[in-house]
């Protein structure tokens, strides 16, 4: 077959494709054609790239010429430079390769010139009139990753037909760029269509794993089915799943609908969506979203406690007034000294099996007559009455419940978050809080969450800062920055929230949720270190508003200072030529030194190798900051809303009456 047939063709590697379009076009038309497909005219800057171009072009006729991405304006001759004054269409003159047909001649360069590549022989570079419609053009497409060509299977009717994002259709690919589609026809009649997609674990891969063409019947490899294989009358096989599972999109594997279901608490297979959500006792489905569960306020139920009731998330507590004791049923109250008191104390002992000094706990419990409240995130709240101890937690919260803690003293360093404690205990109730003072720290037991003392020991994974999602208007959701590290001073002033600032982040990889895998502690400063983000997403420097209104402690409003930090990407070896000029990284804007906060650049670790000749090298060797239209406007406000604590029935009576006896009830007792 004539390689110069009318059909375009391409050669792809793991990170870029070259495509040959045998269409007669002027330079400008060719440039536009490449841009419309999401690429650029080819810029073969290295011998390796030139080799790929050579293999794509092949041994064409000498009469054929192909545009590449080099042009020179009139009177811009620089004959001593490798590119002779020509500039790549990406805007720079960096190259480690040239292939000029003739040595430079000392002409005056009176007119604009563009470069075409000879289709024959050594594919030499020729300069000529940009308005000449040559025989074709070479485009180049860069991408984040590629999928390897599919292996042929026994049951295939022919080779896979690939369609690239730049609309090339061929069976002759070694690599397929992200976004390509593979169509496989099977001998059995049915076909499969696969997409080269981003994988959850990173990288790219085909949307389906092989085998794509099932054998005849169920006998070989269960027909490719994960669960049950059924042989149809026409000889085809179909797959079925056992109860509680549903057939996945690939038609062969089975998936648990609850594995992906967004149920907050409990999930059961079945129903119109393939699953249905349920709430545990003490909770009910939220009216606006049946996937979520909200606390049931049992204290609103008449007669739930004989005397006083305090609701908390997932349960409630009954209390008795001074001179009364809670009976064994946890509801009734009897005058002090009556028979029920011992039973109640026994129950407390049984539930509190943790080796702590119970007298101390009782004393601390009684001493505290401030209110309980939920602490949903990194917040300071003004205490109604400061306790005489540092932090107190209720032990053994089931994992989906937010613990409630007494208001901490404002002079204490704040906890990073109210930790989510894994649910270890088989005991159904929630017992009295373990109170730990700063002078006498107590080791947590299996039923108690760890207490964060003043020296901030490193948090375990279960207790790390929850990710705070932020809507950043200029970025797609996959690229929204999270709050990347939090630092606070050891002693924030009383009644003032600490500053929360994001240090310079190593930005998240696209399409990956930000996680907090590595929290390190130095003194009283805690910094959470995060995995890296590609350098085409500038970080936000955020500062917390100076004062949070006491009446709205659940709202964190972050202002973005819109300070774009210069990014030094993970360096690639620079191309060493005499024609070097600094190139900005793709899609990045460096901030002039004058506008940068003085302290910020010191946070940037230098990642450049010692042999780097340019201060900033491009992320992709062919990239230059394009002139992207900018919509100027005010700096975007970034509001982070933390979930409000569920309204609790405030124990107003507790202020006047001491808590002589109390009980904590889990609604599963009801």
């Amino acid at each position: 077959q004539d390689p110069w047939a009318a059909e375009p063709r391409a050669a792809c590697g793991p990170s870029s494709c070259y495509a040959l379009f045998p269409r007669r076009r002027t330079f400008l038309e060719a440039w536009r054609a490449c841009r419309e497909l999401g690429g650029d005219l080819a810029t073969p800057r290295t011998p390796e790239e030139a080799q790929r171009v050579d293999s794509l072009v092949g041994a064409g006729p000498a009469s054929r010429l192909l545009w590449i991405g080099l042009q020179r304006q009139a009177r811009q001759c620089q004959l001593q430079r490798p590119l002779r004054g020509f500039t790549w269409t990406t805007g720079d003159q960096d190259t480690a390769f040239t292939n000029w047909a003739q040595p430079a001649s000392g002409g005056p360069c009176p007119a604009q010139r563009c470069v075409a590549l000879e289709a024959s022989g050594e594919h030499r570079w020729l300069e000529g009139s940009c308005t000449l419609a040559v025989d074709g053009y070479l485009c180049q497409f860069g991408f984040e990753g590629a999928c390897p060509a599919l292996q042929d299977e026994a049951g295939q009717a022919g080779p896979a037909v690939y369609t690239t994002p730049f609309h090339l259709v061929s069976t002759e690919f070694e690599w397929l760029p992200f976004g390509s589609v593979a169509a496989v026809q099977c001998q059995a009649g049915r076909g499969a269509s696969l997409l080269c997609v981003k994988q959850p674990e990173g990288g790219v891969g085909w949307s389906r794993a092989g085998p794509l063409c099932l054998g005849t019947g169920c006998s070989p490899d269960n027909g490719g089915c994960e669960h049950e294989c059924v042989e149809e009358v026409d000889g085809h096989v179909s797959c079925r799943c056992t109860e509680g599972f549903r057939l996945a999109a690939d038609g062969r594997s089975c998936e648990d609908p609850c594995a992906q279901a967004p149920c907050e608490q409990q999930c059961e297979p079945g129903g119109p969506q393939g699953y249905s959500c349920h709430c545990r006792l003490g909770f009910r489905p939220a009216e606006d979203d049946p996937h979520r569960c909200v606390d049931t306020d049992e204290c609103q139920i008449a007669g739930v406690c004989q005397q006083m009731c305090v609701n908390y998330v997932g349960g409630f507590e009954c209390y008795c007034s001074e001179g009364h004791e809670l009976e064994a049923d946890g509801i009734s109250c009897s005058p002090a000294g009556a028979m029920g008191a011992q039973a109640s104390q026994d129950l407390g002992d049984e539930l509190l099996d943790d080796g702590e000094d119970e007298e101390d706990e009782d004393e601390a419990w009684k001493a505290f007559n401030g209110g309980w409240t939920e602490m949903p995130g990194i917040l300071w709240m003004e205490p109604t009455q400061p306790p005489d101890f540092a932090l107190a937690y209720r032990p053994s919260f089931p994992e989906d419940r937010e613990p409630q803690i007494p208001y901490p003293e404002p002079t204490w360093p704040p906890p990073l978050s109210a930790p989510r404690v894994p649910y270890h205990s088989s005991v159904l109730s929630v017992t009295r809080p373990v109170v730990v003072s700063a002078t006498h720290p107590t080791l947590p037991s299996a039923h108690q969450p760890p207490v964060i003392p003043a020296t901030h020991p490193a948090l375990s994974r279960d207790h790390q800062i929850p990710v705070i999602a932020a809507n950043y208007p200029d970025l797609p959701s996959a690229y929204q920055p999270g709050i990347l590290s939090v630092s606070h001073s050891a002693q924030p002033p009383a009644h003032q929230p600490p500053m929360i600032s994001t240090k310079y982040p190593e930005l998240f990889p696209a399409h990956q949720s930000p996680m907090f895998p590595d929290t390190r502690v130095a003194g009283t400063q805690t910094t959470t270190h995060l995995p890296g983000i590609p350098p085409n997403h500038a970080p936000l420097v955020t500062t917390l508003g100076a004062q949070l209104p006491p009446q709205a402690p659940d709202a964190l409003v972050l202002r973005t200072q819109a300070t774009q930090l210069p990014i030094i990407p993970t360096a690639q070896p620079s191309l060493t030529t005499t024609s070097r000029s600094p190139v900005s990284p793709a899609h990045q804007i460096s901030v002039p030194a004058a506008t940068q906060p003085a302290a910020l650049p010191t946070l940037l670790p230098s990642q450049s190798p010692t042999n780097q000749t340019s201060p900033i090298s491009p992320t992709h060797p062919h990239s230059k900051a394009p002139q992207i239209p900018r919509e100027d406007g005010p700096s975007p406000k970034l509001a982070l809303w933390l979930p409000s604590p569920a309204p609790t029935a405030a124990p107003t009576a507790l202020g006047e009456a001491g808590l002589a006896e109390h009980s904590q009830r889990d609604d599963r007792w009801l």
Partner: antibody, heavy 124, light 108 residues
Framework: QVQLVQSGPEVMKPGASVKMSCKAS????????IHWVRQAPGKRLEWMGY????????TYNQKFKGRVTITVDKSASTAYMELNSLTSEDTAVYYC?????????????????WGQGTLVTVSS | DIQLTQSPSFMSASVGDRVTITCRAS??????VAWYQQKPGQAPKLLIY???NRYTGVPSRFSGSGSGTEFTLTISSLQSEDFATYYC??????????FGQGTKLEIK
């Protein structure tokens, strides 16, 4: 040296067809496009069409409305041009010309070598 | 179609004279312009390609300039063998070549 040698003069009747030849030598025939250009007495040069001997790719001037056909015989390194439905307006000298590919590091589509021309006279 | 207009159509000059012939294009053709010399009974010969590049073997007294729509052929010192007809040609909308009507240069 490069040479394009054309066939001899033709006298044709109106309505007839004429086919002339252009034999190339001194270069690789399939590496260069061949154009046909005519020049009527006292008129400017007029491009008629071309053929790429490498793949027989052809393009014609719309003015000739399908009356012209250009072919090649690669084995003989010869290009042919046939013009049908002749009228007196077609009386002219017909040239074959080779399109240059590059000169001294420049690509260019000017015509660097020409045949001596074939005079076609259309007369009743 | 792109039209090429040469001026003058006829001109007389003497040996040693400096001669300039102009070619105007009806639209921008960049530098895709060539100049040919044709003597009676002969085929055209290429003098200048890409508006300003002298073809191999062409004497240095011939030069070309211009880009866009205006082009000139200059003979710096006319020789007796230079009396001929000169044609400009554009090939920017290749393969639709068009030629100017020609400038006949005669001995004064």
């Amino acid at each position: 040296q490069v040479q394009l040698v054309q066939s001899g003069p033709e006298v044709m009747k109106p309505g007839a067809s004429v086919k002339m030849s252009c034999k190339a030598s001194g270069y690789t025939f399939t590496d260069y496009v061949i154009h046909w250009v005519r020049q009527a007495p006292g008129k400017r040069l007029e491009w008629m069409g071309y053929i790429n001997p490498y793949d027989d790719d052809t393009t014609y001037n719309q003015k000739f409305k399908g009356r012209v056909t250009i072919t090649v015989d690669k084995s003989a390194s010869t290009a042919y041009m046939e013009l049908n439905s002749l009228t007196s307006e077609d009386t002219a000298v017909y040239y074959c010309a080779r399109r240059g590919n590059s000169y001294d590091g420049y690509f260019d589509y000017s015509m660097d070598y020409w045949g001596q021309g074939t005079l076609v006279t259309v007369s009743s | 179609d792109i039209q090429l207009t040469q001026s003058p159509s006829f001109m007389s000059a003497s040996v040693g004279d400096r001669v300039t012939i102009t070619c105007r294009a009806s639209q921008n053709v960049g530098t895709a312009v060539a100049w040919y010399q044709q003597k009676p009974g002969q085929a055209p010969k290429l003098l200048i390609y890409s508006a300003s590049n002298r073809y191999t073997g062409v004497p240095s007294r011939f030069s070309g300039s211009g880009s866009g729509t205006e082009f000139t052929l200059t003979i710096s010192s006319l020789q007796s063998e230079d009396f001929a007809t000169y044609y400009c040609q554009q090939y920017t909308n290749y393969p639709m070549y068009t030629f100017g009507q020609g400038t006949k240069l005669e001995i004064k």
